[in-house]
């Protein structure tokens, strides 16, 4: 039996007879800009964008069906052109076009906003783009704008701004010292400002041997007043007023002194934890400092919390190393030797692609990274000893770590 | 090639103090803990301190403690040690040895030491 | 600390005998212990760590056994090269701690 007359839409065929008998072949070829869609039995078997398929006239059949389906681009996105939206009303298909426009803030840098779904499945190159700008920069708390264009809305991406904080304030993470006041923000690519700001001057704390005995109008920050109340006598003995005063540049404009009725000394501090031993060279009089430090090799003192003991300190937990207690003008020790505790110290194997238990804890910083994968330089953690537990003890415990990155818990991979 | 050179020893009185350095060469001296080891005339190996591999983290013998200081200046690739209040016990060679963790399994090792320099504490 | 103890101190053998030193520690240290070679004037070297894992270069005449407390060093077949001073050294944790030696004499 013969076949039914081979027609391919956008497709141009070469047959090996006109007759179309048992066993007569014909070659089917897609045009530019089309893709081979082949069946068998009304099933999908291949997609392929070239270069030809033979079909076969069995026993009155063609043994396969084909189209020739236009070439699909997708959807173009921020690939094509970045920081746009796209419409595309006549499809996505070989020849259709898609018209972009820029999303706020950016701007329309050329005129022709068409793209082209082009023979090849690719969109055609964008004559035009969209350029990000900036409006004028969101005002920064305690910071006074220094560049007047910057009061406008248009700045190109790389475009400064500077600033200065008011006085008493200071850029963060400046030294103590040098107090910086000035900084700059930048447009960046997606259109924001980079972040600037402006925190308190702070002064030191007074010196330990009035811890507990003063109160602040507001801490330590510009402008607080700090008053230690002394009784009468100090007045009338000239001492003047005991309150000092944190000034811009972040110095005391004074110093307290020790009221007269302050006198004594600290009582022997015994009762200490286990392994922690103090040397008090200077005795135990107001201002008398004693040296902290542990009987046991490589552990350090630090304070922990009244409700924390050494065994069941959290890993997370990051304890301050206290070095010496102070007698206070109120004859107490500051800080109070009950709350100094002896911990293992840190082996010092620290980022060297190995996860040592013992340093993997906040106090060690996490043995530099060497018990996360996201953050061991080999990219594969190597438990030690070997009988260490990735689920447990060496486990990746940095919260700091890619794998506890919020992204990463919604399922996205890292690249 | 790998190498240590110490330098610095010589003949001290006790109380004196002496610094010796260690000059590495031939490998990444920035990635490695460092210790410094010594050894008495005609007795055995004693460990003395070591470093990590920033200098943040130091540890020292029971021996030396608060005496000795350990330190590192990773841009000149040298270790050293500082010696104050020195005794006629801390007469030694002493070498300075790179920590290093052998793989699969990270185990702790000397594995390259200096040739040693004698200090002698003596009146 | 963890103290190391070696024994014999000295022990005199002759070229082609086989040798054991022996290093016990104070408490259980797993694997982790090294020995070293030491010769006259000259610094310690690396020949077995993991308790019996060679040390690259170190000829296969030198075995290392044990694990725990209880730790051999072995040489299967004595060298003239091989009459030096033998270190174990345990590497659980600090401080690290020597053994006291035990040197190997021509008999």
């Known amino acids: 039996t013969d076949c039914p007359e081979l027609a391919v839409e956008n497709a141009s065929l070469n047959c090996s007879s006109s007759d179309r008998y048992h066993g007569a072949q014909c070659t089917v070829s897609c045009r530019t800009g089309y893709v081979l869609q082949i069946r068998r039995d009304d099933e999908l078997i291949k997609s392929q964008t070239g270069p030809s398929v033979t079909v076969t006239c069995t026993e009155g059949k063609w043994n396969k069906q084909v189209a020739c389906e236009p070439v699909d681009c997708s959807i173009p996105d921020h690939h094509q052109v970045y920081a746009a939206s796209f419409s595309c009303p006549e499809g996505t298909t070989f020849g259709s076009q898609c018209s972009f426009q820029c999303r706020h803030p950016a701007q329309l840098k050329g005129n022709n906003s068409l793209l082209t779904c082009m023979e090849d499945g690719l969109w055609s190159f964008p004559e035009a783009l969209c350029e990000l700008m900036c409006l004028a920069p969101p005002p920064v708390p305690n910071a006074d704008l220094q560049t007047a264009r910057c009061r406008e809305n248009k700045h190109k991406v790389g475009s400064f701004c500077k600033y200065k904080c008011k006085p008493g304030y200071h850029v963060p993470g400046s030294s103590r010292k040098s107090k910086k006041r000035a900084f700059k923000t930048q447009c960046t690519q997606d259109g924001s400002w980079q972040e600037g700001a402006c925190v308190p001057v702070t002064c030191d704390p007074p010196p330990p041997k009035f811890h507990g005995l003063y109160q602040c109008t507001n801490g330590f920050q510009f402008n607080s007043e700090c008053r230690i109340k002394c009784e009468d006598s100090d007045a009338s003995q000239g001492l003047g007023s005991n309150v000092i005063h944190c000034r811009k540049d972040g110095t005391w404009n004074g110093s307290f002194h020790v009221c007269q009725e302050m006198q004594g000394q600290c009582s022997v501090p015994n009762e200490l934890n286990s392994n922690l031993k103090l040397q008090c060279p200077d005795g135990y009089a107001i201002g008398s400092e004693c040296a902290t430090s542990c009987l046991d090799h490589n552990s350090e003192s630090i304070i922990l919390p009244m409700n924390v003991t050494v065994r069941d300190i959290p890993h997370w937990l990051n304890p301050t190393r206290v070095e010496r207690v102070v007698c206070t003008a109120g004859l107490k020790w500051y800080p109070h030797p009950a709350l100094i505790h002896c911990v293992k110290g840190c082996e010092p194997f620290m980022g060297d692609n190995y996860c040592d238990a013992i340093n993997n804890r906040a106090f060690c910083n996490y043995d530099g990274g060497d018990c996360c994968t996201s953050t061991v330089k080999t990219k594969k953690v190597t438990p030690f000893p070997m009988s260490c537990d990735l689920q447990g003890d060496c486990a990746c415990r940095d919260p700091q770590a890619q794998e506890h990155s919020r992204k990463d818990l919604r399922g996205y991979s890292h690249g | 090639e790998v190498q240590l050179v110490e330098s610095g020893g010589g003949v001290v009185q006790p109380g004196r103090s002496l610094r010796l350095s260690c000059a590495a060469s031939?490998?990444?001296?920035?990635?490695?803990?460092m210790h410094w080891v010594r050894q008495a005339p005609g007795k055995g190996l004693e460990w003395v301190a070591v470093i990590s591999y920033d200098g943040s983290i130091k540890y020292y013998a029971d021996a030396v403690k608060g005496r000795f200081t350990i330190s590192r200046d990773n841009s000149k690739n040298t270790l050293y040690l500082q010696m104050n209040s020195l005794r006629a016990e801390d007469t030694a060679v002493y070498y300075c040895?790179?920590?290093?963790?052998?793989?699969?399994?990270?185990?702790?090792?000397?594995?390259?030491w200096g040739q040693g320099t004698l200090v002698t504490v003596s009146s | 600390d963890i103290q190391m103890t070696q024994s014999p101190s000295s022990l005199s053998a002759s070229v082609g005998d086989r040798v054991t030193i022996t290093c016990r520690a104070s408490?259980?240290?797993?694997?982790?212990l090294n020995w070293y070679q030491q010769k006259p004037g000259k610094a310690p070297k690396l020949l077995i760590y993991?308790?019996?894992s060679l040390q690259s270069g170190v000829p296969s005449r030198f075995s290392g056994s044990g694990s725990g407390t209880d730790f051999t060093l072995t040489i299967s077949s004595l060298q003239p090269e091989d009459f030096a001073t033998y270190y174990c050294q345990q590497s659980d944790g600090t401080p690290w701690t020597f053994g006291g030696g035990t040197k190997v004499e021509i008999k």
């Open positions: 031939g490998f990444t001296f920035s990635s490695y803990a």
């Open positions: 408490q259980g240290i797993s694997i982790y």
């Open positions: 993991g308790a019996s």
């Open positions: 040895a790179r920590h290093e963790r052998i793989p699969p399994w990270g185990f702790h090792t000397f594995d390259i």
